[in-house]
């Protein structure tokens, strides 16, 4: 028998520095977690103690903090190289800055193979990107070889900016021939490493003949066997065992997100490459694990540029940006409009001639807007200003909801109106009229939404049975501010870009902004 240790991360999302327990900015260092310096300590400890170790990343290193905003992926290559990752799969967010924003900072600089079997380049890009990412890689480990085959969410064109010269194929269809090739190379230990979410990970384990282990990402799935060490609630045991169609037991793993845990899986193979046993657990990277001094020093060196960036002007406003709770928790506020407009703008994807865009709607809890921006400071808007407006380090995500769920959400928005509570929704691509004289749960008297399957966008009444795409904060997607119906009834959820980054990019693009209050949210006569 031959034993392999798989160390794995996924959805790190730019958390190079240690974070608080909820993966936001570290405040009290003695209680902080994660970060590449701490990760390196643990990885090195395991490498020294065990003979056959692979360190793998399942995608979405890009996007999530000011580190990515400033360094644009160079930080990912630098610190992943320093940690000596063995391989990485491409995630959807690796395409956030377009293909060039992937090629130059990461693909050309990574000292480890970057993989995806279901992304096929065409046209002029094919020769430019050739060899910079691979469908699979055979890695030598001790006296054996291990095949790693990569995959990426086929929804990436709707979630990021891969352009028109990359085709995202069905994962299972694309993986099978590559696994067959590995088998033909007499490689009998095969890991599928990819970024399509836990449901697809399980399907790959079930359907792709020859895959021995699946290491996934995208869905931020936390798996754990025994008593979990922090706040995350396990979605199942670690590893999650799937019985394949040909009768094999295939371990599937994921390691939550944000570098809070290091996935740790031990696999025992027989001489024919069959998995005999698998066990392990994610390792919580808490403050009991010291940060590696040399990596920490490097982080501090790179950090200097971030502090300078946060005070630079992104653009100007010529109007007061009203982000006060007195406005945003009670009525349409222009800060809410600005943020929603930025959210939609960030999700412009012309992937189908029938649609002007794949999504037109935005909702945003008023309580998530934490500060106004005064235009009387020469109109200057900085990252620092935006960090005061959006201090929680969240993301603006894409969900699919039925019209009936949206209606419930808008009823919830005003179910206890007047108490300055955070659930009052700011909107984009939506016209809502409330009648507060009616009883809670029956206050939405008009709800019109902007069409997407149209060449001239216009507002049509919401249809209860129709499925709509909506951009919203991850806080709402996870049921925050009492929006349990969103969490319970959403049909799809894909995590998006860092909230501040979305707004800062929009402001930089527009250069001068002047958002207005324009009648997106109305109250019917006599009730307000």
């Amino acid at each position: 028998a031959w034993e392999l240790t798989i160390l794995h991360t996924n959805d790190v999302h730019s958390r190079l520095e240690q974070t608080s327990e909820d993966s936001s900015k570290c405040v009290n260092a003695s209680r902080c977690m994660g970060g590449v310096a701490r990760l390196f300590t643990k990885v090195q400890q395991i490498r020294r103690a065990e003979p056959n170790v692979l360190l793998l990343d399942a995608g979405d290193q890009y996007q999530g903090t000011i580190w990515f905003t400033v360094y644009k992926g160079a930080e990912v290559a630098h610190f992943m190289n320093a940690l000596r990752y063995d391989a990485m799969a491409l995630g959807n967010h690796e395409f956030d800055n377009g293909v060039e924003g992937l090629i130059e900072p990461l693909l050309k600089e990574a000292k480890f193979p970057i993989l995806s079997a279901n992304i096929k380049a065409k046209g002029p890009l094919a020769s430019q990107i050739s060899g910079l990412y691979l469908p699979y890689k055979v890695l030598p480990v001790g006296d054996e070889v291990v095949g790693i085959v990569g995959y990426t969410s086929k929804e990436t064109p709707f979630l990021s900016n891969p352009g028109t010269n990359l085709v995202f194929e069905d994962e299972i269809t694309a993986l099978q021939p590559e696994v067959d090739k590995l088998k033909t190379l007499n490689v009998n230990k095969i890991i599928a490493l990819g970024h399509s979410g836990f449901e697809m990970d399980k399907l790959i384990a079930q359907k792709v003949r020859g895959v021995d282990v699946v290491v996934g990402g995208h869905s931020n799935t936390f798996l754990y066997t025994g008593n979990p060490p922090s706040k995350e609630v396990p979605a199942g045991k670690y590893p999650f065992i799937v019985t394949s169609d040909d009768g094999r037991k295939v371990p599937v793993v994921q390691a939550y997100a944000f570098g809070k845990y290091l996935g740790y899986l031990k696999i025992e193979f027989d001489e024919r490459g069959n998995v005999i046993s698998s066990h392990g657990n994610p390792i919580l990277l808490n403050s009991s694990i010291p940060e590696d001094p040399s990596i920490k020093a490097d982080i501090n060196k790179w950090r200097i540029k971030l502090d300078n960036y946060s005070t630079q002007e992104l653009g100007k406003t010529i109007v007061y940006l009203d982000g006060s709770s007195q406005s945003c928790r009670f009525r349409e506020c222009n800060m809410g409009n600005l943020i929603c407009d930025a959210m939609i703008n960030n999700n412009l994807r012309h992937t189908d001639e029938m649609f002007w865009n794949h999504v037109s709607m935005c909702i945003l809890n008023g309580g998530g807007i934490r500060s106004p921006i005064d235009e009387r400071n020469n109109g200057t808007i900085t990252w620092e200003n935006l960090a005061a407006v959006l201090p929680f380090g969240g993301t603006f995500d894409l969900v699919q909801l039925k019209g009936s769920t949206l209606k419930k959400a808008f009823e919830h928005s005003v179910h206890r109106y007047g108490q300055s509570t955070g659930e009052f929704l700011q909107v984009g691509g939506i016209h809502v009229v409330y009648d507060l004289s009616r009883k809670p749960g029956d206050r939405v008297v008009k709800l019109d939404v902007l069409c997407t399957k149209c060449r001239v966008p216009s507002y049509d009444p919401l249809k209860m049975d129709e499925v709509y795409k909506v951009i919203l904060p991850n806080f709402l997607a996870n049921g925050g501010d009492g929006f349990q119906m969103i969490k319970d009834e959403l049909l799809r959820h894909d995590s998006g870009d860092q909230d501040i980054n979305v707004v800062s990019t929009y402001i930089s693009k527009m250069k001068v902004i002047y958002p207005a209050v324009e009648g997106r949210i109305k109250f019917s006569t006599g009730s307000h």
Epitope: D86, K111, F112, P140, N186
Partner: antibody, heavy 118, light 107 residues
């Protein structure tokens, strides 16, 4: 473009050792195997072994264990092969080569002629 | 070790002819076979891998076929620059092994 530049010819005495270098450029050194291949005059090709610079893993053809030692220097993107206890049987042209994606030899150095003679 | 046998040490041909060079493996190597061309004083050059996949820049007159133990390199219309030594190699398992070579010469 991918290039593998080998060190020049060597004339060595029996029993001595020789170290051949293979300096690479035009790609990320750590991401591909470097293979070494022996070709005796008028003879075929023999695979000596590989080194994977990413994790410095080395695999030898059993036939060449003890004869050759493979190393790599990531900082200079250079692979090395040392041949020890040389005999006339070791007189050959030695090639380094890079894989495309494992197991076949897509790019070759120009070869280094080693002559063992007293 | 897997032995790759190229039974023809030499093959004579004429410019414009179609020629097939064969290679037999001592055990099943599936489709894990590569072909190389070597000219005097030069290093080998990869032509084909995975039995039938042409390497970048290789003219389409070169094709590979076969599976299991029997493999063939075919040149559909021999050009003067094709006169060289051709080796097969199995990339199925280590140690990777080569055939002894077939020299293509003019009749």
């Amino acid at each position: 473009q991918v290039q593998l530049q080998q060190s020049g010819p060597e004339l060595v005495k029996p029993g001595a050792s020789v170290r051949i270098s293979c300096k690479t450029s035009g790609y990320t050194f750590t991401n591909y195997y470097i293979y070494w291949v022996k070709q005796r005059p008028g003879q075929g090709l023999e695979w000596i072994g590989w080194i994977y610079p990413g994790n410095l893993n080395i695999k030898y053809n059993e036939k060449f264990k003890g004869k050759s030692t493979l190393t790599a220097d990531k900082s200079s993107s250079t692979a090395f092969m040392q041949l020890s206890s040389l005999t006339s049987e070791d007189s050959a042209v030695y090639f380094c080569a890079r894989d495309d994606n494992y197991a076949w030899f897509a790019y070759w150095g120009q070869g280094t002629l080693v002559t063992v003679s007293s | 070790d897997i032995v790759m046998t190229q039974s023809h040490k030499f093959m004579s041909t004429s410019i414009g002819d179609r020629v097939s060079i064969t290679c037999k493996a001592s055990q099943d190597v599936s489709t894990a076979v590569a072909w190389y061309q070597q000219k005097p004083g030069q290093s080998p050059k990869l032509l084909i891998y995975w039995t039938n996949t042409r390497h970048t820049g290789v003219p389409d007159r070169f094709t590979g076929s076969g599976s299991g133990t029997e493999h063939t390199l075919t040149i559909s219309s021999v050009q003067a620059e094709d006169l060289a030594l051709y080796y097969c190699q199995q990339h199925y398992s280590t140690p990777f092994t080569f055939g002894s070579g077939t020299t293509l010469e003019i009749k």
